[in-house]
Structure formats: C-alpha cells, structure tokens
C-alpha cells in the first residue's frame, strides 16, 4: 500500500529574469527513491537517478540547474515559463508519487511565494 505523501512548494510566483527553486519532498514512507523526473506540462525537463545522477534535457540546459537535493532550479525566467510543473518520484516498492507545482512568472516585482501544501 502506498502510504507516502509529497509536499511541494505549492503555488509560487517569481519575477521575469529571475530564478526559482522547484522543490518536492516525499514523506511518510520508507520506500526507496530510485528516480525523480521533473516535467513541465508535456515536456521532460530533468531526471535525477539514484545510480546515474542528473540528466538535464538538452533544450533546457542553459536555464535549468540540478538541485538543491532532488529539486530543480529554473533560471532566466520568462513569462512562457508560467504553468504547471510536476515532480514524479519513482520508488521501490511503493511505485510512483506525483507532486504538482504551479509557477507564475510576473513582469512586476510583486512576486511572492504561496503556501506549502500536500498532495496525498
């Protein structure tokens, strides 16, 4: 039975040209995390594998940095970066857990972080 939950940074906002850290955390399970995939809508951004380390998709290499931890740092943000991001935790023996983050990239300096929330 899958008992874990994913805590994410939730709904967040950031300024155009700035950077943001996308972070997820898997808790309430003893399952081993074998891999975390980061996706933006229907695009694979990056993968962190327990054995192989990080792979950043070539088309995002200039603007995506691995970490901290299993998180992902997006740099040189544009308004086009606004949207949903998903962290997909592949675990053994539980299976797959998915967390969702919504990022809004703002033109102005009124960017502020939303509250943390949990996805069961």
């Amino acid at each position: 039975m899958m008992t874990g939950t994913i805590e994410t940074t939730g709904n967040i906002s950031a300024e155009k040209g700035g950077s943001i850290i996308l972070q997820c955390h898997l808790s309430s399970t003893t399952a081993q995390v074998t891999q975390v995939n980061w996706e933006q809508q229907d695009q694979l951004l990056a993968i962190c594998n327990a054995d192989l380390g990080w792979h950043i998709s070539p088309s995002f290499k200039d603007r995506v940095a691995p970490g901290p931890g299993l998180g992902l740092t997006l740099q040189s943000l544009t308004v086009n970066d606004t949207g949903e991001y998903f962290c997909i935790y592949h675990t053994y023996p539980d299976g797959t857990y998915t967390g969702r983050i919504f990022l809004e990239v703002l033109e102005s300096s009124v960017a502020e972080h939303g509250a943390r929330f949990q996805i069961p």
Epitope: Q32, T34, Q35, E39, D42, Q43, L44, I47, N49, D51, L52, H55, S57, S59, H90, Y92, P93
Partner: antibody, heavy 118, light 107 residues
Framework: EVQLLESGGGLVQPGGSLRLSCAAS????????MHWVRQAPGKGLEWVAA????????GYADSVKGRFTISRDNSKNTLYLQMNSLRAEDTAVYYC???????????WGQGTLVTVSS | DIQMTQSPSSLSASVGDRVTITCRAS??????LNWYQQKPGKAPKLLIY???SLQSGVPSRFSGSGSGTDFTLTISSLQPEDFATYYC?????????FGGGTKVEIK
C-alpha cells in the same frame, strides 16, 4: 566503449527451453536498467522484458508472461533471459538493451537468433 | 497498453529531400517518445530521445518534435546513408511499445 554481446540463441523445438545471456562491458552495468527486445523475421520491434538496476522492478510483455524470466548478475555484468514453453511465434532476433533513466535505449546488442521449429 | 501508430508505413524519397515521419500515441505520453533507425541485419540505433533531444553523435539533420499524443521525426536533407527503417517507441509506461516502422526507400 559500451558493448553488449548476446549469446545462447539457436534452434529449439516447440515446448523447449533456452537461456539467453548478454555480457556487458564498458560501463557500470549495475547502474542501468536492462531490457530485452525482439524482432520476428521481417517484422517490427517488440519489447519483451525489463529489469531495474537493483532487480527491484521487473516487467514482462503479456505475450511472454509466465514463460520467460529476466534476471541479472551484477557481479558478472551479465543479463539473462530464461525462455520456457517456447512457441513458433517466439522465433525472432533477441536484443539486449541498456536503458538509462528508464526512458530511452541508448545501446543495443547485435542480437541472437532464436528459432522455434519442429 | 499504449498503441503507437506510425505513418506512413513506407515512403520513397530522393537524396536532399525533406522527410517527415509521424507517430501518434493512443493516450498522452508527455514527451516519453524515442526514435530509432534500423538498417537491414543491424541492431536499431537511437536518434532522438524524450521527443526532441538529439542523441550524441547523430547528425543535426535529424530532429524530433511533439508532445502529448502527436510526434514528428524530420530529416531536413535526406542523405544516402539515411535509407533505412525508422521506429518510434514510448517509454511512458510498461509495456513499452513501438510503432510499426516507416521504411524510407530510394525514389
């Protein structure tokens, strides 16, 4: 240089068994998921089975489930496919393949031909 | 199981032509789509992974695009060594499935 070398193919009667091996070299075998893919003569590619780096996750195509068993020996850098209750439709070239991040097949072996016929 | 439908099944083209092969998944597979080239008697070779990433060592005339259910492999200027069969493959979920292949022949 990454190399995958399959062996163990041959002619076998229906109902018989074969064990395929795939010797890996040139990379850290224990870090990669490994798969078997087959191709019947003149046909397309068909995925057969997969095993994760630590053997924690194993999967099979419905067409071979209950008859084929995938395994690996990380100390010998070798992947195996035990094939039992073979049928004529199992006739194919069998490729072993390296699958980084469980997403793409970046290296294939040269293949070994399995022919099931009476 | 996710079905992968490739079209056309075969095509004739000349050296220098722009060639487009399409692949459609029966459900959304995000960008978990790979393209392979296979020549007779040889193992397949990875060209494009994760829908649009060019595998190291593959000529830049090959490109991939698409996400969700619809994907395209484009060869911008066909070369003599490109006459082969091309397969798409999804890795979104097991069982992994391949398209039926597209044979690119000399016109």
């Amino acid at each position: 240089e990454v190399q995958l070398l399959e062996s163990g193919g041959g002619l076998v009667q229906p109902g018989g068994s074969l064990r395929l091996s795939c010797a890996a070299s040139g990379f850290t075998f224990s870090s990669y998921s490994m798969h078997w893919v087959r191709q019947a003569p003149g046909k397309g590619l068909e995925w057969v089975a997969a095993i994760s780096s630590n053997t924690g996750s194993i999967g099979y195509a419905d067409s071979v489930k209950g008859r084929f068993t995938i395994s690996r020996d990380n100390s010998k850098n070798t992947l195996y496919l035990q094939m039992n209750s073979l049928r004529a439709e199992d006739t194919a070239v069998y490729y072993c393949a390296r699958v980084p991040y469980d997403v793409w097949i970046d290296y294939w072996g040269q293949g070994t031909l399995v022919t099931v016929s009476s | 199981d996710i079905q992968m439908t490739q079209s056309p099944s075969s095509l004739s083209a000349s050296v220098g032509d722009r060639v487009t092969i399409t692949c459609r998944a029966s459900q959304s597979i995000s960008s978990y789509l790979n393209w392979y080239q296979q020549k007779p008697g040889k193992a397949p070779k990875l060209l494009i992974y994760a829908a649009s990433s060019l595998q190291s060592g593959v000529p830049s005339r090959f490109s991939g695009s698409g996400s969700g259910t619809d994907f395209t492999l484009t060869i911008s200027s066909l070369q003599p060594e490109d006459f082969a069969t091309y397969y798409c493959q999804q890795s979104y979920s097991t069982p992994l499935t391949f398209g039926g292949g597209t044979k690119v022949e000399i016109k």
